[in-house]
């Protein structure tokens, strides 16, 4: 049986007992700015190239033990959600990882900026097909981080980011508040906004759309064949990065505006229970859950 | 995300440091009437004081960025402050990343080509 999240983003006409998840995104490179990853995990081996980029702060606390599987946990899971063989969205997409988050999942605005600059320089040195940049991280509103995202977007790169897990207005966070970035909130199997402890998904007019972000099965760094369930707006953003990769692979000439329009067009409308959001934010928050197109050129999305 | 909105600062703090009239030995003064601004994260625990991104005006070349960074170091040294240039940006935004005392912000804001300065802050896996 298909994991609920893959079923949710798949158009009904492709659902069947013998469902083979879509195998697309092969013309697209997805950059992941996150923790280190276990690149030879069975789900993602050969699909993720670990770049030599690393810019992370030291871990907090004198008694912190650097355990490899924990250091790799967040990034490995997200790489699996984007392009994993069995539980991934865009099974044909190749990925490149940059380490901007330390073993505690913490990074800096400056490290992220240098990472974005690295991507731009790589793009200039060796132009490839369409690029998607996944930023599964958030900090406070940052003029400079938003400006860097804007510049990269204007260079033709599609940026997808997590709305944030603070149960707050996404406009107060970066890169979620950057207008050129596709900002993704998280919903669950009941199409409810995701609650995470006392907090939950961010909301508001800086969110572009929502995607599955609760109990998402993906590669676990605990072992080379392990899977684990994780939740958050990072997982939601990874779904949209995968969908974007598939759309761009099918139509490589799409502009950012056209891609955004398609993402919105193919989303499920008005399925989210808005009562979860603060009253003043309900009208501002898009009631959209991301989905793949029920493609007329089927072979492009479902090879 | 969500195109079409204007940049909203929210709780974001913008501290405009007025430029003093004296030129402080600069070869080029900032353009008349422009005031470089200082920004920092509104969420105090996420702030990383002591590291700053100095963002220069859009058309600034790499050589000018490097010169501006060196000028800041020289002027800071004259005041007895150690500074360290951690990275010079080019390709996306012109500017540089500097480790320095917050006491030097007023001086840094007066440098030629400076558009704004942002204190570094934390980001987190979501």
């Amino acid at each position: 049986s298909i994991p609920w999240n893959l079923e949710r983003i798949t158009p009904p006409r492709y659902r069947a007992d013998e469902y083979q998840p879509p195998d697309g995104g092969s013309l697209v490179e997805v950059y992941l700015l996150d923790t280190s990853i276990q690149s030879d995990h069975r789900e993602i081996e050969g699909r993720v190239m670990v770049t030599d980029f690393e810019n992370v702060p030291e871990e907090d606390g004198t008694r912190f033990h650097r355990q490899a599987s924990k250091c790799d946990s967040h990034g490995t899971h997200l790489a699996g959600v984007v392009s994993g063989r069995d539980a991934g969205v865009a099974k044909g997409a190749s990925m490149r990882s940059l380490r901007v988050l330390n073993c505690q999942g913490k990074g800096t605005v400056s490290g992220t900026l240098i990472g974005l600059e690295f991507i731009r320089k790589s793009q200039l040195v060796q132009p490839v097909g369409p690029l998607v940049v996944l930023l599964p991280l958030a900090g406070g509103y940052s003029r400079v981080l938003n400006a860097a995202c804007q510049r990269l977007a204007r260079a033709g790169v599609v940026l997808v980011t997590a709305a944030g897990n603070f149960r707050d207005d996404a406009c107060l966070y970066s890169p979620a508040s950057a207008p050129e970035v596709i900002t993704v909130g998280a919903t669950n199997a009941q199409d409810q906004p995701v609650t995470l402890g006392t907090l939950g998904t961010n909301f508001g007019r800086c969110v572009d759309l929502f995607a599955p972000g609760e109990d998402i099965i993906g590669a676990s760094s605990d072992c080379s064949t392990c899977f684990v369930s994780q939740s958050g707006t990072s997982q939601a953003a990874a779904h949209v990065a995968g969908i974007a990769a598939m759309m761009l692979s099918a139509e490589p000439e799409l502009t950012l505006a056209e891609l955004r329009q398609r993402l919105i067009h193919f989303s499920a409308k008005d399925v989210i229970n808005e009562a979860w959001f603060p009253e003043d934010q309900r009208v501002l928050t898009p009631n959209l859950v991301a989905a793949l197109p029920p493609s007329t050129h089927e072979n492009l999305y479902f090879q | 995300g969500a195109m079409g909105q204007e940049d909203e600062d929210g709780d974001y703090e913008e501290l405009v440091l007025a430029l003093r009239s004296e030129e402080d030995g600069l070869a080029e003064a900032p353009e008349h009437g422009t005031t470089a601004t200082f920004h920092r994260c509104a969420k105090d625990p996420w702030r990383l004081p002591g590291t700053y991104v100095v963002v220069l005006k859009e058309e600034t070349h790499l050589s000018q960025s490097e010169r501006t960074a060196r000028r800041l170091q020289a002027q800071a040294a004259r005041r007895g402050y150690l500074t360290k240039i951690l990275h010079v940006f080019h390709g996306l935004l012109p500017g540089f990343l500097v480790k320095m005392s917050g006491d030097l912000l007023e001086l840094a804001l007066k440098l030629p080509h400076v558009d704004y300065i942002e204190e570094d802050s934390s980001v987190f896996a979501q």
Epitope: D23, S39, D40, E45, G46, M49, C223, S224 | -
Partner: antibody, heavy 115, light 109 residues
Amino acid sequence: QVQLVQSGAEVKKPGASVKVSCKASGYSFTSYGISWVRQAPGQGLEWMGWVSAYNGNTNYAQKFQGRVTMTTDTSTSTAYMELRSLRSDDTAVYYCARGYVMDVWGQGTTVTVSS
Amino acid sequence: QSALTQPASVFGSPGQSITISCTGTSSDVGAYNSVSWYQQHPGKAPKRMIYEVSNRPSGVSNRFSGSKSGNTASLTISGLQAEDEADYYCSSYTSTNMVFGGGTKLTVL
């Protein structure tokens, strides 16, 4: 191009150990693990286990647990498979292959166990 | 881990099509999209012909195709040629390991 080159044939006595090497080239060594597969004369392929070139973690087939050790040396992009307490039925060709995907194979190393 | 079930031998004439089946369980073939097919000529290392059920690596003839239904995967070779005579093995992920089929000897008559 991507290549896996294995060490030469070995003849061992029952009870001894054998260590086969597999040198990788033409790709980023740590992006894939190494699988080890053996084939007894006239028999089919048998998966023995996998070793991570990224962090050294291993995943052994239950049948070989306790008798096999798989390791990697990232400085030389080489993987090793050591099989202990050899028996005559361990006589086989031992192959290394790239990752779980096993898309590229070594040429094979013949190990003969005979008294 | 018991091997996946393949027919011991299959015969075909040049130009014909043949299909080799590979039957597993809901814990291996049925559960994963990672079924591969390997061709092995005598005295040679195996060569991957199909991966992830139906994908062909570059350089492999489009006469080779793969599919899966439930717990059974299939390899089809169309327009059979003399050089296709070889042993063919399927493999699949299991929850923790890998498992091969027992192998099928293809004879081109």
